[in-house]
């Protein structure tokens, strides 16, 4: 049987000679040099040779165990004479045995880490770690332990777990943003001798919400015109807060002062800036000056750091109003008059007035627009805005005159404004009525008495409040004898009626008939109107057959007292 | 040319009230904004207020809030300044300045008035 | 309130001498900042306004400058009728005056 133990090997030999490993050796073996010994297997031949009389075994190089910690070699012993093996072929072990020839090595070169600002001290950062190649089962050479070389006194590291946690209260990124650690790890658990390796750790502080925004001015003072509309914006406030994104942000608001209701603020979301905005009509007249208190505020908060006070600043805002020079203002959009059509020239209709708005209310003087009086009918008093006649009226002409007045500042000629005017002529009763067409009729030869032969109507140009009233009758020299009557209706009409029995063409073919219409108001109106009748042959149906072709006159109306 | 000419000196009693006036000429008087300003006796300028004599508007310097009143007659373009309550600290040189701008409160005082020395003494 | 101050309250010089003047603010006032010279028993009178701008009828040889909180009033050749007090103004917001500066002959 064979005779050895497990053989053991010191790694990293540096001897001149080669390293020794053991003695391969068989109980038949007299020491005759009957026997040789075959080593095969990992590394015979080449980093383990045997004397093949003597069974001894040598490493030719030097080993590693990190490489290679364990070889599995065959033996095998044979009778030189007759070729046999004299023990069975058998494997056994060459272990390496470990010295501590490795540091520990970081999994990361460079680590990156972050850690809020003004985080407890212990707060966990980042977790490093060393590996020893070394085993781990003998011996320290593989028990690494963490130590900090850089970065005191900010950071500690736990030596045996390599956790890296903060070390300082209070640590304020707006101070010191950024932090160069140095961990080493060192095997042979820490002690004298142990071998080390180290790694780079960049910490960078992260932002919370720890400052509050801040004005750089107590006070602003912005100008805006007064005519500035509605969401005009007049001027930009900004507060700067140290701290970062979100917990950068601010929000504006207008919390006091007289100009409260006057304007806003709104926050550029992209700058960060307060605009101050018109919010309604600003009036110089009015109001001058303005101040208002805005403040500026983070939206997002964190309780914790309530205590160094509140997260909000406060600026003083003055806001001065500019006079902007404004045309005059008449009293009325538009002014409506009345005047008689028989009014005289130069009589008086009524006035207009207009004010300079601004503050100096400076002195207005007065115009009509030539443009829209072509013929100079009105004129207007320049100094107080007093309209009157420069030409008789006719309401039957023209019943509304609409005119335009100016009103202009004296000092400043440019500033002017307009107001139309509605000028209304009141009816005076100046015209006659008259037949409202040219009446020609006939009778038929045998005509009754009494039958209406005409139906009269009369127009008057005239527009009484109370309506026309007409009256009609035959004038006075055609009253006696006549051989029609005239029949008042009393609604403004008046019939013709024959006042005989019969009628002879061949004695008179035509009859005029002069007829007086008078309207009913004052001074009394009244014209004479003619009505020509033609005395014709008729069926028995009243239906005219002929009347003598006679040349027909169209008599003018007589007017009296017109 | 524009000139400002003030009242007289006074001498008053603690307590009582001053009024001191400031006449304008050489321009439009409705159309500037008019200052007051007071120097006490070696010390420096110190704002009190102003008014705008087109609409009586006035705007006064928080510290004699409640006891200065400006007021304009513009019928004789002149400006008026009433101190109440006054105390010795009151004794001063009172001016008053026009504003340089007519449209905006804002800006220097480019005409000032010859000054009136304004005595409390009990 | 914006507070102006003035320095020095008081300086010795000669005629001829350069005489520089300065007034600081307690906060951005831009380039609105006048200067004016008073004598005594007189009103102040107008130099400078804008910070730089020459009121009219004043000698050439005031000159004022700066602009935000820092400003400076300078008189280049001093002359026997400029030793009086001087005065800076604010006037960007509200009105505010420095202490003044006496300028007194050597």
């Known amino acids: 049987s064979w005779m050895w133990n497990q053989f053991f090997l010191l790694e990293e030999y540096t001897g001149s000679d080669y390293q020794y490993v053991g003695k391969l050796h068989s109980d038949q073996d007299r020491g005759d040099g009957s026997l040789k010994y075959i080593l095969s297997g990992d590394g015979a031949g080449d980093l383990f040779i045997i004397n093949e009389n003597t069974g001894d075994i040598q490493a030719t190089k030097r080993l590693d165990r990190e490489e290679k910690p364990v070889y599995i070699l065959r033996a095998q012993a044979i009778n030189r004479r007759t070729g046999r093996p004299v023990e069975p072929e058998s494997e056994f072990i060459i272990k390496i045995h470990d010295i501590n020839d490795n540091e520990p090595i970081f999994t990361k070169e460079v680590y990156t880490a972050t850690v809020p600002e003004m985080s407890d001290v212990g707060t966990f950062v980042v977790q490093v770690t060393a590996t020893d190649a070394d085993d781990p089962t003998y011996g320290n050479s593989a028990k690494v332990v963490y130590s900090i070389l850089q970065g005191q006194p900010y950071f500690s590291v736990e030596s045996e777990t390599g956790i890296i946690k903060t070390a300082l209260l209070n640590m304020d990124r707006e101070n010191r943003e950024q932090y160069q650690v140095v961990i080493q790890a060192k095997d042979m658990g820490g002690q004298m001798g142990g071998l080390s390796g180290t790694t780079t750790v960049n910490i960078t502080l992260t932002d919370v919400n720890d400052n509050p925004p801040r004005f750089p001015q107590s006070t602003y003072q912005f100008k805006t015109p007064e005519s500035s509309p509605p969401g005009t914006p007049i001027g930009r406030i900004k507060a700067s807060d140290a701290d970062v994104g979100e917990n950068a942000e601010i929000e504006y608001s207008i919390t006091d002062g007289e100009g409260l209701d006057m304007f806003d603020v709104i926050t550029d979301q992209e700058t960060q800036e307060g605009i101050i905005t018109v919010k309604k009509l600003l009036d110089f007249e009015k109001k001058k000056v303005y101040t208002l208190k805005v403040e500026a505020s983070n939206p997002y908060v964190e309780p914790r750091f309530l205590y160094l006070g509140p997260f909000k600043d406060s600026a003083t805002v003055r806001i001065v109003v500019e006079d902007v020079d404004e045309p005059p203002v008449f009293s009325k959009l538009a002014y409506i008059l009345q005047i008689r059509e028989d009014a005289q020239i130069n009589t008086t209709i009524g006035s207009v007035t207009a004010q300079d708005p601004d503050a100096a209310r400076n002195p207005v003087k007065y115009s009509v627009d030539r443009h829209t009086d072509m013929d100079r009918i009105f004129n207007i008093d320049s100094g107080n805005g007093s309209i009157f006649t420069s030409k008789l009226l006719d309401r039957e002409t023209l019943l509304w005159h609409n005119i335009t007045v100016i009103a202009t500042e004296i000092n400043n000629p440019k500033q002017s404004s307009r107001v139309p005017l509605y000028i209304k002529v009141l009816d005076v009763n100046d015209n006659a009525p008259e037949f409202a067409e040219f009446y020609e009729t006939f009778v038929c030869e045998k005509a009754k008495a009494d039958q209406l032969i005409q139906t009269l109507h009369a127009v008057d140009k005239d527009d009484p409040y109370s309506g026309h009233q007409f009256s009609f009758s035959l004038a006075p020299e055609a009253a006696s004898g006549s051989n029609f009557t005239i029949q008042d209706n009393k609604d403004n009409t008046a019939g013709i009626l024959t006042r005989k029995n019969g009628y002879n063409r061949h004695e008179m073919s035509t009859y005029l008939l002069p007829v007086v219409i008078s309207d009913n108001d004052y001074p009394v109106q009244s014209s004479t109107g003619t009505v020509t009748v033609r005395v014709c042959a008729c069926d028995h149906h009243g239906n005219m057959q002929s009347c003598h072709a006679e040349a027909l006159i169209h008599p003018t109306g007589l007017s009296t007292g017109a | 040319e524009v000139q400002l000419v003030q009242s007289g000196a006074e001498v008053k009693k603690p307590g009582a009230s001053v009024k001191v006036s400031c006449k304008a000429s050489g321009y439009t008087f409705t159309r500037n904004f008019m200052h007051w300003v007071r120097q006490a006796p070696g010390q420096g300028l110190e704002w009190m207020g102003w008014i705008y004599p087109g609409d009586g508007e006035t705007e006064y310097a928080s510290k004699f809030q409640g006891r200065v009143t400006i007021t304009a007659d513009t019928s004789t373009s002149t400006a008026y300044m009433e101190l109440s309550s006054l105390r010795s600290e009151d004794t001063a040189v009172y001016y008053c300045a026009r504003g340089v701008y007519g449209g905006a409160a804002g800006g220097y005082f480019d005409f000032w008035g010859q000054g009136t020395l304004v005595t409390v003494s009990s | 309130d914006i507070q102006m101050t003035q320095s020095p309250s008081s300086l010795s010089a000669s005629v001829g001498d350069r005489v520089t003047i300065t007034c600081k603010a307690s906060q951005n006032i831009y380039k609105n900042l006048a200067w004016y010279q008073q004598k005594p028993g007189k009103a102040p009178k107008l130099l400078i306004y804008?910070?730089?701008t020459l009121q009219t009828g004043v000698p050439s040889r005031f000159s004022g400058s700066g602009s935000g909180s820092d400003f400076t009033l300078t008189i280049s050749s001093l002359q026997p009728e400029d030793f009086a007090t001087y005065f800076c103004q604010q006037y960007y917001s509200g009105w505010a005056f420095g202490q003044g500066t006496k300028v007194e002959i050597k």
């Open positions: 804008d910070a730089n």
